[in-house]
Interface confidence: low
Amino acid sequence: AGVFELQIHSFGPGPGPGAPRSPCSARLPCRLFFRVCLKPGLSEEAAESPCALGAALSARGPVYTEQPGAPAPDLPLPDGLLQVPFRDAWPGTFSFIIETWREELGDQIGGPAWSLLARVAGRRRLAAGGPWARDIQRAGAWELRFSYRARCEPPAVGTACTRLCRPRSAPSRCGPGLRPCAPLEDECEAPLVCRAGCSPEHGFCEQPGECRCLEGWTGPLCTVPVSTSSCLSPRGPSSATTGCLVPGPGPCDGNPCANGGSCSETPRSFECTCPRGFYGLRCEVSGVTCADGPCFNGGLCVGGADPDSAYICHCPPGFQGSNCEKRVDRCSLQPCRNGGLCLDLGHALRCRCRAGFAGPRCEHDLDDCAGRACANGGTCVEGGGAHRCSCALGFGGRDCRERADPCAARPCAHGGRCYAHFSGLVCACAPGYMGARCEFPVHPDGASALPAAPPGLRPGDPQRYL
């Protein structure tokens, strides 16, 4: 267990021409707040998909009123960190969405109005316990500067927060076979419950006796480093063998430098030497133009005539990412059977199996659901020799073969329009109503039925208020 921490440093106009208008005015003062959403692995970044690692909401920032005639400055920010607690192992690779929300404080009917000002998203690799990573992201004409880190909550330690530390039972030494717990040298590692020999640094287990590998490591005990840094160039496969093994471990294993940066070890960590057009701790920040040919794998570059304006890569089939540097997620082939969750770790596919299934592709049935097929993503639920299908949203029937229209029950109140959606349904509310099902009137006395949480944050249903 641990906490992901996000510190917003600044939010304001990006460099270059076309500065955005201030989101606030003398007539309509406003304040900002932020939402962060985290997902494990190389998840889809669709805003509607669940924040499986967690989400957090910042406090409101100070009220800001634009000075007439002045350009939009960096806007005043909320105090404090955004903290997202996570219970299980830190996945090492994660996707994030950071949203900047504007709360307008004018005299509009129904109280404060919220609108999404900017949304940035990305995928990053991060070890727990490491230093703050710096980042700059642009969304249209806005620029967001922030830092982030993942830290373990005692008694967990390690790069994935999977090793446990306990106070020493004796003042002088740890028990047989147990090491001191760096950096908590006065504590000792708790006895491992994973498979014997499972790497405490690069493996973890969710059940006794297993050994699951973090990204960049492989083998039955997660002791074999997998590096693509010397095997794949950022513009596609080089002449070197793909997926090759290199000696390790070391801070440059797995190549922490993005965008073709070269990694060199330093006494305490590593240093990235970035190619032209990239900068940042891991070469993750781009100041590149189309003239630099930033789109890999045959991507088409549009815009970006000067370093201060953004470019967009239109990727050919089979590639994705802001620079077309990533192959399409092989999980789209649905290799995990029996409803297993697929993670494309780059060097390998990993399946996280549902309860009752095991095996590299979740092909082994451990329960009395053997031979029971639930269609359309449904899962078989066992119990005392009997079993039934728990169907995915949008499907029903004994074997989940019947398509269910989530809008058939007319769930949107007060004249709201219902739209079927991959995660359920979405209600577009009639004027004067809000809520997941348009069930809340917007009151003329300035109070709304959801007084403080911005739309879409809680509870779980997708909502569209704006």
């Epitope: 669940p50 957090a56 910042s58 607690p85 639920v381 989530p406 997941a436 403080a452 809680r458």
Partner: antibody, heavy 122, light 107 residues
């Protein structure tokens, strides 16, 4: 370990206000929503609202109590407060605070306080 | 608001028997349903979250199933300490609501 410790029982007259406290320990206080649930004698559970301690202005109230309930927090003492005003006899109940888990976009309540009995009687 | 209806209101069984408790929602709540156990004089205790996800420290004899509007809590083999009141809760839409409860008593 995670603990939520609530203030002691209260006896109030109709029309008065009561402020119940809930002191949290054993976890990062500002990271988890705290919810308030009440239970009248012999009755079921009723959700009153919740507060995000990382931002004291981030609250959600049950419409039924909205005009009478105020939830606040003091990060220096890791304490959340629930104040209910204009008390009436039907507000006699045990008031619980609970910490909400953070999984996906909706929340269950995994740790509960011991409860505070509030009796409203003239 | 979403109404959760629990049945039966009272269930009389003996230790060792299998208990099946039902919770029906007035509209679809996806998988945002949780189960709690409450004993006299105590705070509720979370048993199952999100229909079927187990909770650390809760015995494996407790399991949940269902989807959409119909949900079930199953106790595979009753122990003496399992006799209590059980509540379901939805966190799919405001306001969050609980079912009326099912009292599980010794026959």
């Amino acid at each position: 370990q995670v603990q939520l410790v609530q203030s002691g029982a209260e006896v109030k007259k109709p029309g008065a206000s009561v402020k119940v406290s809930c002191k949290a320990s054993g976890y990062t206080f500002i990271s988890y929503w705290i919810t308030w649930v009440r239970q009248a004698p012999g009755q079921g559970l009723e959700w009153m609202g919740d507060i995000y301690p990382g931002s004291g202005s981030t609250t959600n109230y049950n419409e039924k109590f909205k005009s009478r309930v105020t939830m606040t927090r003091d990060t220096s003492t890791s304490t959340v407060y629930m104040e209910l005003s204009s008390l009436r006899s039907e507000d006699t109940a045990v008031y619980y605070c609970a910490r909400e888990t953070t999984v996906g976009g909706a929340y269950a309540m995994d740790y509960w306080g011991q409860g505070t009995l509030v009796t409203v009687s003239s | 608001e979403i109404v959760l209806t629990q049945s039966p209101a009272t269930l009389s069984l003996s230790p060792g028997e299998r208990a099946t408790l039902s919770c029906r929602a007035s509209q679809s709540i996806n998988n945002n349903l949780h189960w709690y156990q409450q004993k006299p004089g105590q705070a509720p205790r979370l048993l199952i979250k999100y229909v079927s996800q187990s909770i650390s420290g809760i015995p494996a004899r407790f399991s949940g199933s269902g989807s959409g509007t119909d949900f079930t809590l199953t106790i595979s083999s009753l122990e003496p300490e399992d006799f209590a009141v059980y509540y379901c809760q939805q966190t799919n839409a405001w306001p969050l609501t609980f079912g009326g409860g099912t009292k599980l008593e010794i026959k």
